[in-house]
């Protein structure tokens, strides 16, 4: 058994406040 290092959350989907790139004016899917 090996300890697995912590990993981050999934990459934020478009529309999420932490999604990469500019936020579109139109809604997009996160959650």
């Amino acid at each position: 058994w090996q300890h697995q290092p912590d990993s981050g959350p999934p990459a934020a989907a478009p529309g999420h406040p932490l999604a990469p790139g500019p936020h579109p004016a139109a809604p997009s899917s996160w959650g």
């Epitope: 406040p17 936020h23 997009s28 899917s29 996160w30 959650g31």
Partner: antibody
Framework: EVQLRQSGPVLVKPGASVKMSCKAS????????MNWMKQSHGKSLEWLAV????????AYNRKFKGRAILTVDKSSSTAYMELNSLTSEDSAVYYC?????????????WGTGTTVTVSS | DIQMTQSPSSLSASLGERVSLTCRSS??????LSWLQQKPDGTIKRLIY???TLDSGVPKRFSGSRSGSDYSLTISSLESEDFADYYC?????????FGGGTKLEIK
């Protein structure tokens, strides 16, 4: 059981700062984003900000940017929000809320809430 | 920001009654809507996500639906523990925004 336990109520003077905590348990802290919400007395909810506990990335509501600071302590699975230059408008209950950024676990677990009263 | 208009703001109903709460979105949110329940002690619990999917442990008397830009939460037969505040939340676009809430009271 997944839980978000928040620090107790605080009374602060106008112009002061407050730092509240949110201790996560029952899940991998770094695997979910942590959001903060505001609920003024008798009113609806408002999203303030979010942090990625894994790398410290943050995003803020335009309304609060510059006054709210989010941080985490990964070793204790605790998220913090500091609010500066407080006014009576900041008197509210503040909730931490987790989300995974994409899937069904979006705002699925809410903290117990921290009541902040700003009064001289 | 997307505006969520929730109605009614308050509602008095009797045990066993069927009630519906509605939220209207100012823009298309593509079913990215949740319903939250807040008890008098401040505890908040998510009931529904993606417009109509019930969270685990939520009683089947709760249901969610959509008609155009109107999203509804229906409680088929009210029980005493259902008297609380309810909020809708859109998460299609940043920032996430909430409806103004509905206070559900016992008649």
């Amino acid at each position: 059981e997944v839980q978000l336990r928040q620090s107790g109520p605080v009374l602060v003077k106008p112009g002061a700062s407050v730092k509240m905590s949110c201790k996560a348990s029952g899940y991998t802290f770094t695997g979910y984003y942590m959001n903060w919400m505001k609920q003024s007395h008798g009113k609806s909810l408002e999203w303030l900000a979010v942090i990625n506990p894994y790398n410290g990335d943050t995003a803020y509501n335009r309304k609060f940017k510059g006054r709210a600071i989010l941080t985490v302590d990964k070793s204790s699975s605790t998220a913090y929000m500091e609010l500066n230059s407080l006014t009576s408008e900041d008197s509210a209950v503040y909730y931490c809320v987790r989300d995974d950024g994409y899937h069904v676990r979006f705002f699925d677990v809410w903290g117990t809430g921290t009541t902040v009263t700003v009064s001289s | 920001d997307i505006q969520m208009t929730q109605s009614p703001s308050s509602l008095s109903a009797s045990l066993g009654e069927r009630v519906s709460l509605t939220c209207r979105s100012s823009q298309d949110i593509s079913d990215y809507l949740s319903w939250l329940q807040q008890k008098p002690d401040g505890t908040i619990k998510r009931l529904i996500y993606s417009t109509s999917t019930l969270d685990s442990g939520v009683p089947k008397r709760f249901s969610g639906s959509r008609s155009g830009s109107d999203y509804s939460l229906t409680i088929s037969s009210l029980e005493s523990e259902d008297f609380a505040d309810y909020y809708c939340l859109q998460y299609a676009s940043s920032p996430p925004t909430f409806g103004g809430g509905t206070k559900l009271e016992i008649k």
